[in-house]
């Protein structure tokens, strides 16, 4: 299976999104410019819908300058984000408390610099195992209704668990069509057997699959964003099939229950 890393296609177009062969895997980072075409139909995330405002206060956007979203992230501590390791960039900005994709000022927004990014030492580009990274912000957040952390689940997900994934990633695939506002999508955790059947020899216990039969999926640009189950952070958007939302090819997410010790110890050691 050919791997196509799309997290950085806005700055070095090795694999532009419209040339990735069907049926290949892709990391789900992207570049959504402030002038990206927005999708006026009801087709969201892929077949999700606009999130209700103030319901995802842990959702962060990672931006390349000037205001180009390339990945999502999650606030897990007043000064720390989690995102996918494949979203690592040396220079980026962090936006919290913002609902729309466009850079227009919103009263609840808070902007930050990342002062330290710590990928999991077991991550291996361009692979998918251990696809997580901690980012330390240049200061603590000011907790508000729009900006607050979420707890990471120490319990591993069971098949059938209902979860919510969110992001500003493309709402169509293989075309690239970015939404106006943050998208939310209800998905169900699949059994590890179904996950392994969908992606033979590519799944390990640092990943889980989620989706449904109705063509709902996360996609390019959602990478690093949250999968929330029963009120706590269960996973991060990591990778999936290309195009997104194909039957029997679910999204694959970083299985955070396997990393709670590493997350806690890394934050403590660097605070």
């Amino acid at each position: 299976v050919t791997e196509h890393v799309l997290a950085n296609n806005d700055v070095s177009c090795d694999h532009p999104s419209n040339t990735v062969p069907s049926g290949s895997n892709q990391d789900l980072g992207a570049g959504a410019g402030e002038d990206a075409r927005s999708d006026d139909s009801s087709s969201r995330i892929i077949n999700g819908s606009d999130c209700d405002m103030h319901t995802q206060p842990w959702q962060a956007a990672l931006l390349l300058r000037p205001n180009q979203l390339y990945c999502g992230a999650v606030l897990v501590h007043p000064q720390w984000l989690l995102t996918a390791a494949h979203c690592r960039k040396k220079v980026f900005r962090v936006r919290l408390g913002h609902y729309s994709l466009s850079p227009v000022y919103e009263s609840g927004q808070q902007m930050f610099q990342g002062v330290k990014s710590i990928p999991h030492p077991g991550y291996s580009h361009p692979g998918h195992s251990n696809d997580l990274m901690l980012i330390k912000l240049n200061r603590r957040i000011r907790p508000t209704k729009d900006v607050r952390p979420i707890n990471v689940s120490s319990h591993c997900p069971s098949a059938g668990t209902k979860c919510l994934v969110s992001g500003w990633g493309t709402t169509k695939s293989p075309q690239v069509h970015f939404p106006k506002v943050l998208q939310c999508l209800n998905i169900s955790v699949l059994s590890q057997k179904r996950c392994e059947d969908a992606y033979p020899r590519q799944i390990d216990d640092t990943m889980f699959c989620a989706g449904d039969k109705a063509g709902r999926d996360s996609c390019q640009g959602d990478s690093g964003g949250p999968v929330v189950c029963n009120g706590s952070l269960q996973g991060l958007v990591s990778w999936g099939d290309y195009p997104c939302a194909r039957p029997n090819r679910p999204g694959v997410y970083t299985n955070l229950c396997k990393f709670t010790k590493w997350i806690q110890e890394t934050i403590q050691a660097n605070s």
Epitope: N8, V11, S12, L64, R65, A85, R88, K89, K90, V91, Q113, V115, K116, I118, P119, H120, P121, G122, Y123, S124, H125, P126, N138, N270
Partner: antibody, heavy 117, light 110 residues
Amino acid sequence: EVQLQESGPGLVKPSGTLSLTCAVSGFPLSNYAMSWVRQPPGKGLEWIGDIYPSDIIDYASWAKGRVTISVDSSKTQVSLKLSSVTAADTAVYYCARDNNDYGLDIWGQGTLVTVSS
Amino acid sequence: AIDMTQSPSSLSASVGDRVTITCQASQSISSWLAWYQQKPGKAPKLLIYLASTLASGVPSRFSGSGSGTDFTLTISSLQPEDFATYYCQQGYTNSNIINTFGGGTKVEIK
């Protein structure tokens, strides 16, 4: 054209301060991290430090307290100052741009600084 | 602190040879490793970043592999212009680091 050009005195007296500038052209400093690297004659590359657009600076542990890296107000030059120099600081000094994926893709031609009385 | 160790420090090879240079990190640096080529009197040139991604304009005879602590730069068929010194550099962390670069490997004509 994307270019980096180091400049500064080629000779510095022991215990003095080495001051170099790196003129940046062809790209905005606001989008990239910049590194200073040096190479003593006949030896390998030594990392000195990085400066980010947010003015966050990382220094090599040997350089802390002796080195200052900064960007000028016009955002067209990166500066390096190294204090209390000795003969061991004699080297070719390079500035370089990070490609945002942790690789130094653009380098200056380097400038030789000799520490001698 | 993370230390980068390159081996060998020098090697002799002929045009057309397959050449392998290794770089070992004292602890895992995941995939954040770059390789550079430097010729006498010149600035280094980026060859590979993210352990295996070829930099723009670099010939395909250069390849990089590895993750964690062990990395390899391979030149599949050595060309006359490849005789130079090669350096690895870790980009995993800048915290408490003496040097991000390895000590270098000089590739000489046999």
